[in-house]
């Protein structure tokens, strides 16, 4: 043999009851001791710090925590230091340590030890993981390491959960003993939090301890609270909630295309868009997610806003005779009234449209001009103004003729046309053209689609030639002789020089 | 170099107790434990039992429990045998003898006597 | 306890002559965790304290003349004066310090 000492590193019992501390001990044969005495030590291993002496077999003087509480129930001469401690009060609980007195210089203190922890609970064993819909067991444990008093085994508060079943005086690994009892339950989500107790009763004595242990329910998210479809106008402020039931509390994150907009580890989680403009409208997205499932709802925020100023697609210059289409789109919550004007008259009009398509067949000169598209909702009216040209051959109005007043000859030839005309003065009988680039001869001035063109001639009062006036552009060329007017029919102003 | 000093010569009468000093000197005492032995007259050794000087913790060997006392003053490096309710068997020289002890952890080892006091006489008699 | 038995109880012996003493244990005294014989001879002379000769069964102690061994294991000792001096007149005892500690009856060395 050798030294050595086998005792369980931890033991426990009840307060008020008793613990046997299990205890074998070994030395080298070639000792051969006439007696084996031996002493236990609370607390402390060393002689030295005086530990309180628990129990001591050479003499009946102990420490008085120990006065009548301490009994050697081993046989030290076979080698067994099984202690026993009654009464048990809590400052009894510590570490204790054996040591074999064997005679002669050998008395050797073995650092194996028992760590006595006198308890007042039982003890309730869950498993780490509890979750909902799957099978469970919940033992309650006691130590019965007292030969005089055994524990009696009762559930509390577990109607509902199931009958325990009990499984009686059980060896633990190190000698120790326990008592224990089983409860097999399917939890479900509502048992969270459930308080469930254990109580061991002492037969024959008034000793009676309770111990509660909380059920912690693992169950997946589900989103109770979330807003219904939401509708507010642009600038305003929008607070979207989403709140979720889960053990333990989920991840919440909202989501809007596929993009995380916000997310946090709680029960309920805000979206605030602050200032919400048409951008933001759409549908959100809340996944509350952990690690036993998850869940998912989704909101529709409407953002309510004017209309934007209205875009105009399409023709805007036109050959005349041709077909003109006219797309003005905008882009509104409520969708607009749309309506295109042209000088105050309703050319189109479309209701709770975001799109108005104008149609004008075989467009003449008269359809050239400014024309408005008007979009409009109760949050407010935009306008976007376009303009139509109209392309034709030159048209050389009626209004066009010739005046003398003194010695000096005006022709006036006034031309509507699109695109801007060239001008020409002829003067037949002189085998001339002038043109209107000749700025000595001829001023021109354009206004819209008008053109004028005066010709001025000096000293031809007398004898005024034929003037023919032609106009050309590349859609054609219009001719006339300009008609003279007398003096007193002549009403012009001079422009320039 | 070491030296045990007894105290000297003791006449009791039966019943009556007698402290027997032991003196150290030439060593560090708490090194090594303190042992006492018996010789009556004529008569081989005996060993009493020992006391651990640095601990303060006295063995007594079967013989010699309950009217024996080992104990120390290790202040002025002395160690004591007191023996009470005194019997005419008790007339010997009682001895103390030191015996080297190795420290390893909470145990140790203890060696041979290699010291020995002159004895102390102790006679009891009526 | 274990018990010491040593032999003869009186030996007488010619000075310059070789002189032993035996001693047997009970019980072995070597101890397995260290392979020692916890054995050692004393000697006392009269009016004196014993003196330590011998330790470990055959370890002399310093300052002791090396006319002196011992030797022997297990249960089976000798202590030898290899050339007997008037000095070496004594008690010679053998004594164990592996268990409660005990000592020989002792044998008294004469000078024939």
């Known amino acids: 043999g050798h030294w050595g000492a086998w005792m369980p590193s931890s033991i426990s019992a009840f307060e008020g009851t008793c613990v046997s501390i299990p205890c074998r001990f070994d030395f080298p044969d070639e000792l051969r001791p006439a007696v084996v005495h031996g002493v236990w030590y609370f607390n402390s291993p060393y002689p030295k710090n005086y530990p309180p002496v628990v129990f001591k077999s050479r003499t009946q003087v102990v420490h008085e925590s120990f006065q009548g509480r301490s009994r050697l129930l081993g046989d030290l001469g076979l080698r067994n230091c099984t202690l026993l401690l009654s009464t048990l009060s809590p400052e009894l609980g510590g570490k204790y340590y054996f040591r074999g007195d064997l005679g002669g210089y050998n008395q050797y203190t073995f650092s194996e030890h028992s760590v006595l922890d006198i308890i007042n609970t039982p003890n309730i064993v869950v498993p780490p993981e509890v979750v909902a819909g799957t099978e469970v067991e919940v033992s309650c444990m006691v130590p019965d390491n007292c030969p005089e008093l055994r524990p009696e085994l009762s559930w509390l508060g577990h109607e509902g959960l199931g009958e325990p079943t009990v499984l009686g005086r059980l060896r633990e690994d190190e000698g120790t003993w326990v008592q224990v009892s089983l409860l097999h339950f399917v939890p479900t989500r509502e048992a969270n939090g459930h308080r469930l107790g254990c109580q061991a009763a002492f037969p024959n004595t008034t000793l009676q301890f309770e111990g509660y242990a909380s059920l912690d329910v693992k169950y997946p998210p589900v989103i109770v609270e979330m807003n219904s479809s939401v509708e507010a106008i642009e600038g305003s402020h929008v607070s979207l909630l989403c709140g979720a039931d889960s053990n333990p509390p989920p991840l919440l994150t909202w989501m809007r295309d596929g993009m995380v907009l916000r997310e946090a580890v709680a029960e309920s989680l805000y979206l605030d868009l602050e200032e919400v403009t048409p951008a933001e409208d759409g549908i959100y997205a809340c996944l509350a997610e952990n690690a036993y499932g998850q869940d998912n709802r989704t909101v529709e925020l409407s953002v309510m806003y004017a209309p934007w100023k209205p875009t105009v697609n399409g023709t805007v210059v036109a050959v005349e005779g041709e077909t003109v289409s006219i797309l003005c789109s905008t882009q509104s919550n409520p969708d607009p009234i749309l309506t295109i004007f042209k000088e105050k008259q309703i050319l189109a009009t479309v209701i709770y449209e975001s799109q108005l398509q104008l149609e004008l067949p075989a467009v003449t000169p008269e359809d050239d001009g400014e024309y408005w598209c008007v979009a409009e909702n109760q949050y407010g009216q935009r306008a976007t103004a376009f303009n139509l040209s109209v392309e034709f051959a030159p048209i050389i109005l009626l209004e066009s003729h010739c005046a003398a007043a003194r010695d000096t000859v005006q022709c006036l030839c006034v031309v509507k046309s699109n695109p801007e005309p060239s001008v020409a003065f002829e003067l037949p009988s002189r085998n001339v053209t002038v043109n209107e680039t000749e700025r000595e001869f001829v001023y021109s001035e354009r206004s819209g689609l008008l053109l004028t063109s005066i010709l001025t001639l000096r000293g031809q009062a007398q004898a005024p030639p034929r003037v023919i006036c032609t106009s050309r552009n590349l859609y054609g060329t219009q001719s006339l002789e300009l008609p003279f007017q007398g003096a007193h029919r002549l009403m012009w102003a001079k422009i320039g020089p | 170099q070491v030296q045990l000093v007894q105290s000297g010569s003791e006449l009791k009468k039966p019943g009556a107790s007698v402290k027997v000093s032991c003196k150290a000197s030439g060593y560090t005492f708490t090194n090594y434990g303190m042992n006492w032995v018996r010789q009556a007259p004529g008569q081989g050794l005996e060993w009493m039992g020992w006391?651990?000087?640095?601990?303060?913790?006295?063995t007594y060997a079967d013989d010699f429990t309950g009217r024996f006392v080992f104990s120390l003053d290790t202040s002025v490096s002395t160690a004591y045998l007191q023996i009470s309710s005194l019997k005419a068997e008790d007339t010997a020289v009682y001895y103390c003898?030191?015996?080297?002890?190795?420290?390893?952890?909470?145990?140790?080892?203890?060696?041979?006597?290699?010291?020995w006091g002159q004895g102390t006489l102790v006679t009891v008699s009526s | 306890d274990i018990v010491m038995t040593q032999s003869p109880d009186s030996l007488a012996v010619s000075l310059g002559e070789r002189a032993t003493i035996n001693c047997k244990s009970s019980?072995?005294?070597?101890?397995?965790?260290?392979?020692?014989?916890?054995l050692a001879w004393y000697q006392q002379k009269p009016g004196q304290p014993p003196k330590l000769l011998i330790y470990w069964a055959s370890t002399r102690e310093s300052g002791v003349p090396d006319r002196f061994s011992g030797s022997g294991s297990g249960t089976d000792f000798t202590l030898t004066i290899s050339s007997l001096q008037a000095e070496d007149v004594a008690v010679y005892y053998c004594?164990?310090?592996?268990?409660?500690?005990?000592f020989g009856q002792g044998t008294k060395l004469e000078i024939k």
């Open positions: 019980h072995s005294v070597l101890y397995s965790s260290n392979q020692k014989n916890y």
């Open positions: 003898a030191r015996n080297p002890i190795n420290y390893y952890g909470i145990n140790y080892e203890g060696y041979v006597m290699d010291y």
């Open positions: 004594h164990q310090y592996l268990s409660s500690l005990t």
């Open positions: 006391i651990n000087t640095y601990t303060g913790e006295p």
